[in-house]
């Protein structure tokens, strides 16, 4: 039942999680943990925020969005196969057992082997296409080669990301971005 996200070895993985603060600066503590959300708190915490700031993080895990506006999406830098698994985003809403909990499944795939350069690729390299991908970390701008290369790598990755981002669709379609207060 977890929402699934994908990345390749060596890329940055992006796991979305959002809430809407009741007022600007009126933040809610959030924790990210490796493993499904337990009943209370987060297990194996990799990053935590409090009412003011990120107060705990481990290497390679960071928040690239504006967490002060409720974007607490997790970026995992330079992923390896060992990063595969379920991650818990827990929005610690004040109250008794009132937290919002999201289990997100990260699937890491081996890096694609880039084929040897061809004459066509040499030609198009003089006119590189630019594609900015949001889904793999901090607005990485990647220079891409020929159209076949785009289709095989970036577009398929983006298509997978769009297809797999059921959480984002749910949030959009049902108005389920969490509003505090």
């Amino acid at each position: 039942s977890e929402v699934e996200y994908r990345a390749e070895v060596g890329q940055n993985a992006y796991l979305p999680c959002f809430y809407t603060p009741a007022a600007p600066g009126n933040l809610v503590p959030v924790c990210w943990g490796k493993g499904a959300c337990p009943v209370f708190e987060c297990g194996n915490v990799v990053l935590r925020t409090d009412e003011r700031d990120v107060n705990y993080w481990t290497s390679r895990y960071w928040l690239n969005g504006d967490f002060r506006k409720g974007d607490v999406s997790l970026t995992i830098e330079n992923v390896t196969l060992a990063d595969s698994g379920i991650y818990c985003c827990r929005i610690q809403i004040p109250g008794i057992m009132n937290d919002e909990k999201f289990n997100l499944k990260l699937v890491i795939k081996p890096a694609k082997v880039t084929p040897a350069p061809t004459r066509q690729r040499d030609f198009t390299a003089a006119f590189p296409r630019m594609l900015t991908t949001r889904g793999h970390g901090p607005a990485e701008t990647q220079t891409l080669g020929s159209l076949p290369d785009i289709n095989l790598t970036q577009i398929s990755t983006l298509a997978n990301e769009l297809r797999d981002s059921r959480l984002a669709n749910d949030l959009r379609d049902s108005g389920a971005t969490i509003r505090i207060g």
Epitope: S1, E2, A36, C37, V39, G95, I96, M97, N98, D99, E100, K101, F102, N103, D170, L171, S174, A176, I178
Partner: antibody
Framework: QVQLQESGPGLVKPSETLSLTCTAS????????INWVRQPPGKGLEWIGW????????KYNPSLKSRATLSTDKSKNQASLNLDSVSAADTAIYFC??????WGKGSTVTVSS | DIQMTQSPSSLSASVGDRVTITCKAS??????LGWFQQKPGKAPKTLIY???RLVDGVPSRFSGSGSGQDYTFTISSLQPEDIATYYC?????????FGPGTKVDIK
């Protein structure tokens, strides 16, 4: 706004199964805990169990001796409680709650032949 | 299971009085204690969580304190609308357990 509504038969015969449904709205159903609590007439509150609709995890009050089963239907934003082999002692108002902060109005169930 | 004892079981006080209810857990519950107000025919309403944190919108005359096994709920100045039964709840571990309740009325 967050709303929960319990529904089910008001009268159940002894030894039968009590079935209640809790319909939730106003929030992301799969991301929040649901608790069930009951209150016999003129008595205090008793916790029945907990379910997390996101993955179906459950916890139960051992005092119910495995008679309770909690489940969810995510497509309908509904949580369900089944209580087997009921007796007069199960007569109560049954509440569902999101976490324990937002409660339904309660559903009165009488066990009688 | 963690047992919760609550006292008194009932009390009568005058409008404006300070009212105190205590709740004791059979073991340390790490401040995972809530207080609820229930009026006849209504669902319980959360007033306090984590022992001393007031739920948004709840009047400031309600307060909670305590740690470990011993907790206190206070109404600093009793109002007519505060007539209700008050319950404590431990949510440190399953099964969750409520205190038996304290019925508060006006003299």
């Amino acid at each position: 706004q967050v709303q929960l509504q319990e529904s089910g038969p008001g009268l159940v015969k002894p030894s039968e199964t009590l079935s209640l449904t809790c319909t939730a709205s106003g929030y992301t159903f799969t991301s929040s805990d649901i608790n069930w609590v009951r209150q016999p007439p003129g008595k205090g509150l008793e916790w029945i169990g907990w379910i997390f609709p996101g993955d179906g995890s459950t916890k139960y009050n051992p005092s119910l001796k495995s008679r309770a089963t909690l489940s969810t239907d995510k497509s309908k934003n509904q949580a369900s409680l089944n209580l087997d082999s009921v007796s007069a002692a199960d007569t109560a108002i049954y509440f569902c709650a999101r976490g324990l902060d937002y409660w339904g109005k309660g559903s009165t169930v009488t066990v009688s032949s | 299971d963690i047992q919760m004892t609550q006292s008194p079981s009932s009390l009568s006080a005058s409008v404006g009085d300070r009212v105190t209810i205590t709740c004791k857990a059979s073991q340390d519950i790490n401040s995972y204690l809530g207080w609820f107000q229930q009026k006849p025919g209504k669902a319980p309403k959360t007033l306090i969580y984590r022992a001393d944190r007031l739920v948004d919108g709840v009047p400031s005359r309600f307060s909670g304190s305590g740690s470990g096994q011993d907790y206190t709920f206070t109404i600093s100045s009793l109002q007519p609308e505060d007539i209700a039964t008050y319950y404590c709840l431990q949510y440190d571990e399953f099964p969750l357990t409520f205190g038996p309740g304290t019925k508060v009325d006006i003299k």
